[in-house]
Interface confidence: medium
Amino acid sequence: LRPSRVHNSEENTMRALTLKDILNGTFSYKTFFPNWISGQEYLHQSADNNIVLYNIETGQSYTILSNRTMKSVNASNYGLSPDRQFVYLESDYSKLWRYSYTATYYIYDLSNGEFVRGNELPRPIQYLCWSPVGSKLAYVYQNNIYLKQRPGDPPFQITFNGRENKIFNGIPDWVYEEEMLPTKYALWWSPNGKFLAYAEFNDKDIPVIAYSYYGDEQYPRTINIPYPKAGAKNPVVRIFIIDTTYPAYVGPQEVPVPAMIASSDYYFSWLTWVTDERVCLQWLKRVQNVSVLSICDFREDWQTWDCPKTQEHIEESRTGWAGGFFVSRPVFSYDAISYYKIFSDKDGYKHIHYIKDTVENAIQITSGKWEAINIFRVTQDSLFYSSNEFEEYPGRRNIYRISIGSYPPSKKCVTCHLRKERCQYYTASFSDYAKYYALVCYGPGIPISTLHDGRTDQEIKILEENKELENALKNIQLPKEEIKKLEVDEITLWYKMILPPQFDRSKKYPLLIQVYGGPCSQSVRSVFAVNWISYLASKEGMVIALVDGRGTAFQGDKLLYAVYRKLGVYEVEDQITAVRKFIEMGFIDEKRIAIWGWSYGGYVSSLALASGTGLFKCGIAVAPVSSWEYYASVYTERFMGLPTKDDNLEHYKNSTVMARAEYFRNVDYLLIHGTADDNVHFQNSAQIAKALVNAQVDFQAMWYSDQNHGLSGLSTNHLYTHMTHFLKQCFSLSD
């Protein structure tokens, strides 16, 4: 089902998209991810907000928690205990950073239909979760971790040194949350809940970013965040494990850091429980080209954790950084020592490998000039993963099953031919033992979610097919989309072009380049979207193009690592190269070309505008990075090394937007930033503006008071309206 191909015989009933459609979210779609609670059961929140339990095998469903109970505490989320005796209800959601938030939690006893009274949870809580078995609770309050054996019991305090902005227990600090884990939590139950592992982050020596939050008080508040910029002091991390059955007996035991990692600054990257008495930790040197996976065992005699050198596996990159965006996580097999993991093969493509003893002896499971993207599940006889192998389109995702019980292993594409026109980009969600799974298709047609049998792959039912959206789009003139590639100097540049509904190759159209371009990103994807650029093509007659150049992901290490230690060079060159190729196609008005981007895309759009090529008439940068010295250490150093004389300071200095201030003289530039951006600090745009003023270069700017990196709420409407006016003016389009 491709909405762009929906034709209505009554052409006059068809209308173009409006900006209002986009801002109101008129054409948004739904997905259905089952909240699995067993091999054959899942929970789902119904349209009327009841929490319903579905049993696939019996076909029965019943409400386990009524909307009345939810409403009684204004709950916006819930969590069922594994023993099904209790539900936590989450309310008073208060967002902090990208993933973190605080909330108030109430525990509802399903056996008597009442809220648990006595020893209530403190508020607000930073993180709360059930144990994987039974109904133990672990939670983080004021940066300390607490444990309850049962919801009504008094809590046992595990840590005592937690302090705001200084010591974080069980939750990450800003940089670990955004750039390393990336989660709101930093604690992990062992499979049966015997042990609880947690991270402690010490931010005492980290420099603090401070910015004003204006609010509506007489004096603005100052927000302080320990935020390590490139080259600055980093958080010090330690990992502890406590026996939750007898937490006071030995107390938390620290897991040792591998010697080769501990010899200099390092990061903890993830923790994976293998069994109740075996845990796997991943560590990374600050210079992020060496990662160590360490498998540790519980020693009963000492009540401590032993991480022998023989169980340390090193992953090293000689051409770039370790991993893709993150170092991949292991998926352990049933023997509890061997595992599957995605890393680069000898040809420089990310593939699944099976590691039994050493990384050197790893058995390669997938291979080819494409990449394995994610391992979803390993069972006794199958491994499910996603890749972009099918028909050699890097922007697609299909789900595959490899039989690992038989030799040689056989491979089957589960999704390739299911709804080929409609669905070329999938993810999956598996029940226990992969008895059943849900497929969620994101496009290129209207998204659809379906339920499947884990043994036969047979479709059982449609969970969500977005019928209302399909009907609503019947009288909309959607733009046409095409995904193609350019071959330039041994580099393949994939692009997506969004064309006006009545596109005519013999006419000339204004061109807008939308760019992100960050390392290990991908913009050219076969997904459905009705968004701002859809409107610009549908109503305003623009051609919009997205190009994946050097530094982008899932096409091999040669393309990915091309930008290593040289951010801001090839990403920009490749956008410019693509624009020249688009002009050669004959339907682009070369006097009306613009570029825009957000975040990393704002950095690239700024550099492209200041490239001195004369290609761009105008452009927009939203919340751009302007110097890599201003951005987070973990992200920046992964790709750029350190801003020191003996490392890469020279390129840090050469790659700033400010250094090119003079070159903005002949373009129309719109610079936009939120003043409360905790991620890409307002400082970045402030420095661009200062450099432009000092160079006496005219430009336009818009700030959004008290808005963060997402520019959400009413700011979103204002932002897109403002950018629309700017582009229409640039392209001489009537309002």
Partner: antibody, heavy 120, light 109 residues
């Protein structure tokens, strides 16, 4: 800077008692297991006792089991060794040592020691 | 109980020479759990090597550790005047919690 300062040593008669203290500074005391190690005059090093960071777990060498008690006060950043039923063979310099972590690993910092002499 | 035996008892060498100290365990010790310490007269011991081969912070690279199983070695590539001292190996991997070797004295020839 990590510092460990032992005190409480001295001359005591066989069968007597003594309490050693070790004042710690320069690190988060409660996050580390601690030990006592002794060295008899002209002899080698002998581990005596260890305690976990929380104080919930204690261990002793066979030679002192039942006579010595290790403890800690995390609010005061202080480690203790209560020595009862002292014998002549307990005569030694007693060192307080910090382990590398809460778990039972090598000693990365040592105090200067306090001399205990058991003699009649 | 694991017993650590160090040899030789005394090693007489001149500055600039190479020193090789041996530590043998009565049963296998995880290399993750073997350390070496240096002690000078009237001073507390100082950590040199942990995990059999990892140098502690601030230890010069002329000190190196190696070995696995039951045989471990501490090597001082070129003796400096300040290196003349007693060296102890220690295991911290099984009950009893810690065991030290009896020590090797490195003195000036």
């Amino acid at each position: 800077e990590v510092q460990l300062l032992e005190s409480g040593g001295g001359l005591v008669q066989p069968g007597g008692s003594l309490r050693l203290s070790c004042a710690a500074s320069g690190f988060t005391f409660s996050s580390y297991a601690m030990s006592w190690v002794r060295q008899a005059p002209g002899k080698g090093l002998e581990w005596v006792s260890a305690i976990s960071g929380s104080g919930g777990s204690t261990y002793y060498a066979d030679s002192v089991k039942g006579r010595f008690t290790i403890s800690r006060d995390n609010s005061k950043n202080t480690l203790y060794l209560q020595m009862n039923s002292l014998r002549a063979e307990d005569t030694a310099v007693y060192y307080c040592a910090k382990t590398h972590s809460t778990s039972w690993y090598y000693f990365d910092y040592w105090g200067r020691g306090t001399l205990v002499t058991v003699s009649s | 109980e694991i017993v650590l035996t160090q040899s030789p008892g005394t090693l007489s060498l001149s500055p600039g020479e190479r020193a090789t100290l041996s530590c043998r365990a009565s049963q296998s010790v995880s290399s993750s759990y073997l350390a070496w310490y240096q002690q000078k007269p009237g001073q507390a011991p100082r950590l040199l090597i942990y995990g059999a081969s990892s140098r502690a912070t601030g230890i010069p690279d002329r000190f190196s550790g190696s070995g696995s199983g039951t045989d471990f070695t501490l090597t001082i590539s070129r003796l400096e005047p300040e290196d003349f001292a007693v060296y102890y190996c220690q295991q911290y991997g099984s009950s009893p919690r810690y065991t030290f070797g009896q020590g090797t004295k490195v003195d000036i020839k």
